[in-house]
C-alpha cells in the first residue's frame, strides 16, 4: 500500500502547473454514491490534474460529477494556466475577470484583489487561502493590467505571458532555493511550517524547503498555513515534484520523482481544507 | 444619498430564531458586499457578517458562525440575517454596512434593536 | 484576532480647543499591500456610526477639516483641532487590515 516507485520524467516547465480550481467541488473525491447502477460519469482528479472517468452508482455523491469528458473539462480545468491568455488585439477580458470574488474554503485570510464587473475596477477582498477562483490578485497592479481597461477601452497589459495558476501572477515569483534549482510547486511548499494557534499536538508533515525533503511536525489543531499535510506521502506528492533541476541551458528539465501508486478508486486526503 | 434601514428586531426568547432586514438605495447594491455588525446595549462594536456582491460566499465571526445566516436579494436591494439559536449574549443594536472598494465598511444603517431574554 | 485598545475611555474637553485620541492594535495594521487599513468611527448620541477617516488619515466626504488621523503600525491618533459642539459622542478606531474586522472601546467625548 505504500509501495513507492521513482521514476524519471523528462517535463517542460509548464507541466504540473501549482494547482488552483476554478470551483471548489472540484477538489472532491470520485464519489459512486451508496446505489448500485454502473453508470459512466467523469470527475476531476486533483492529483492528475485531468478529467478522468470512474463508475457512478446512480445516487447521492457529490457535484464532482459530469456527464461528459467536455462538462468536466469545462467546469475544471483551465488550459490558460499553460497557454498565453488575451491579446490586446482582441479587447477581450479572460473570463474569470467575470467571476465574484470568492474567499474559498479556508480561514488564513489574506488580502488580495478581485475585478468587480460591476464598478469595473480592481477592489481588495479577503481571501481564505485556498480554493477560490482565478479572479484572485496579489496586487492592485496585477489585477488592473489583467481586468481593467485601459483609458481607450484596451486592455492595460499584453498578455504575452503565461498566467502563474497559483497565485495570477503574471511571471513566476522568485524563490530562494539553490540556484540549479526552480521551484515549480505550489507557493505553499515554501513556507514554513506553523503549528498554528490552539493547544491540540496532531501529527503533519511539511515541506522543508531547504533540505527538499517532508518533515514532521505537530500541528495545534487550526490556523496554520497551507504546508500542511496528514502524511509524508500527500506531502511529497504535493511539493516534492515541484523541486525541478534544471539542465545548465533551459531546455526540457529531467526530475526524478516518487509517485505513489494510485488504486482504481483514489483516496483522496484534504491537503487544500485545513482544520477549522 | 446612500440609505440602509433596518427591521425586524425585536424580544425573543432565547433559543429562539428571528430574521433583519436592510433596505438598501441610493446605490448600485449588487456592486458592494455587504456587512452586518451589532453593538451590545453600552458597549462597543463587534463585526458579525460580511457577503460577497452576488451573495454566493460569506464570512462570520466565530461567536455566530452556525447559527446566523446572512444573505442578499440584489433584485430587492436587501440584505438579510437570519438569527437561529439565540442566546442573552446576542442582545445588541445590529447595523448593516456597506463596504467599499477597500474592503472597509462605509455606510451605516440607523440599526435595529434584538433583545433575547426569557 | 487583533486587539484595539483606545485611550482616553472618556475625553472631557472644552469648547474650542484640541481633542486627542490614541488607539493602539496589538498587531501591526500595515497589510502586505503596503496600505494600513485603521479607521475612524463617529457615532453621536443616539445616532448609527458614521465613518470620519479611512486608512489612517483620508477624510471621508463631508468631514470638516478639523479631524485628523494619523500614525502607523500599531500606534495611531485621531486629533480634533478645535472642538465644537457637534463632535461630542463616541469615538471608535477599527482595523480592517486582518480579519475579523475588530474595534476599539471607544472613546467618549463630552463637553466640559
Known amino acids: 500500500d505504500s509501495e513507492e516507485d521513482e521514476e524519471h520524467t523528462i517535463i517542460t516547465d509548464t507541466e504540473l502547473p501549482p494547482l488552483k480550481l476554478m470551483h471548489s467541488f472540484c477538489a472532491f473525491k470520485a464519489d459512486d454514491g451508496p446505489c448500485k447502477a454502473i453508470m459512466k460519469r467523469f470527475f476531476f482528479n486533483i492529483f492528475t490534474r485531468q478529467c478522468e472517468e470512474f463508475i457512478y452508482g446512480g445516487c447521492e455523491g457529490n457535484q464532482n460529477r459530469f456527464e461528459s469528458l467536455e462538462e468536466c473539462k469545462k467546469m475544471c480545468t483551465r488550459d490558460n494556466a499553460n497557454r498565453i491568455i488575451k491579446t490586446t488585439l482582441q479587447q477581450e477580458k479572460p473570463d474569470f475577470c467575470f467571476l465574484e470574488e470568492d474567499p474559498g474554503i479556508c480561514r488564513g485570510y489574506i488580502t488580495r484583489y478581485f475585478y468587480n464587473n460591476q464598478t469595473k475596477q480592481c477592489e481588495r477582498f479577503k481571501y481564505g487561502g485556498c480554493l477560490g477562483n482565478m479572479n484572485n490578485f496579489e496586487t492592485l497592479e496585477e489585477c488592473k493590467n489583467i481586468c481593467e481597461d485601459g483609458p481607450n477601452g484596451f486592455q492595460v497589459d499584453n498578455y504575452g505571458t503565461q498566467l502563474n495558476a497559483v497565485n495570477n501572477s503574471l511571471t513566476p515569483q522568485s524563490t530562494k532555493v539553490p540556484s540549479l534549482f526552480e521551484f515549480h510547486g505550489p507557493s505553499w511548499c515554501l513556507t514554513p511550517a506553523d503549528r498554528g494557534l490552539c493547544r491540540a499536538n496532531e501529527n503533519r508533515f511539511y515541506y522543508n524547503s531547504v533540505i527538499g525533503k517532508c518533515r514532521p511536525f505537530k500541528y495545534s489543531g487550526c490556523g496554520g498555513n497551507e504546508n500542511n499535510f496528514t502524511s509524508k506521502q500527500e506531502c511529497l506528492r504535493a511539493c516534492k515534484k515541484g523541486f525541478i533541476q534544471r539542465i545548465s541551458k533551459g531546455g526540457l528539465i529531467k526530475t526524478k520523482r516518487k509517485r505513489k501508486k494510485q488504486r482504481v478508486k483514489i483516496a483522496y486526503e484534504e491537503i487544500f481544507v485545513k482544520n477549522m | 444619498e446612500v440609505q440602509l434601514v433596518e427591521s425586524g428586531g425585536g424580544l425573543v426568547k432565547p433559543g429562539g430564531s428571528l430574521r433583519l432586514s436592510c433596505a438598501a438605495s441610493g446605490f448600485t447594491f449588487h456592486s458592494y458586499a455587504m456587512n452586518w455588525v451589532r453593538q451590545a446595549p453600552g458597549k462597543g462594536l463587534e463585526w458579525v457578517s460580511t457577503i460577497t456582491t452576488r451573495g454566493s460566499y460569506t464570512y462570520y465571526a466565530d461567536s455566530v458562525e452556525g447559527r446566523f445566516t446572512i444573505s442578499r436579494d440584489n433584485a430587492k436591494n436587501s440584505l438579510y440575517l437570519q438569527m437561529n439559536s439565540l442566546r442573552a449574549e446576542d442582545t445588541a443594536v445590529y447595523y448593516c454596512?456597506?463596504?467599499?472598494?477597500?474592503?472597509?465598511?462605509?455606510?451605516w444603517g440607523q440599526g435595529t434593536l434584538v433583545t433575547v431574554s426569557s | 484576532d487583533v486587539v484595539m485598545t483606545q485611550t482616553p475611555l472618556s475625553l472631557p474637553v472644552t469648547l474650542g480647543q484640541p481633542a486627542s485620541i490614541s488607539c493602539k492594535s496589538s498587531q501591526s495594521l500595515l497589510d502586505v499591500d503596503g496600505k494600513t487599513y485603521l479607521n475612524w468611527l463617529q457615532q453621536r448620541p443616539g445616532q448609527s456610526p458614521k465613518r470620519l477617516i479611512y486608512?489612517?488619515?483620508k477624510l471621508d466626504s463631508g468631514v470638516p477639516d478639523r479631524f485628523t488621523g494619523s500614525g502607523s503600525g500599531t500606534d495611531f491618533t485621531l486629533k480634533i483641532s478645535r472642538v465644537e459642539a457637534e463632535d461630542v459622542g463616541v469615538y471608535y478606531c477599527w482595523q480592517g487590515t486582518h480579519f475579523p474586522f475588530t474595534f476599539g472601546q471607544g472613546t467618549k467625548v463630552e463637553i466640559k
Open positions: 486608512l489612517v488619515s
Open positions: 454596512a456597506r463596504q467599499d472598494g477597500n474592503f472597509l465598511m462605509d455606510y
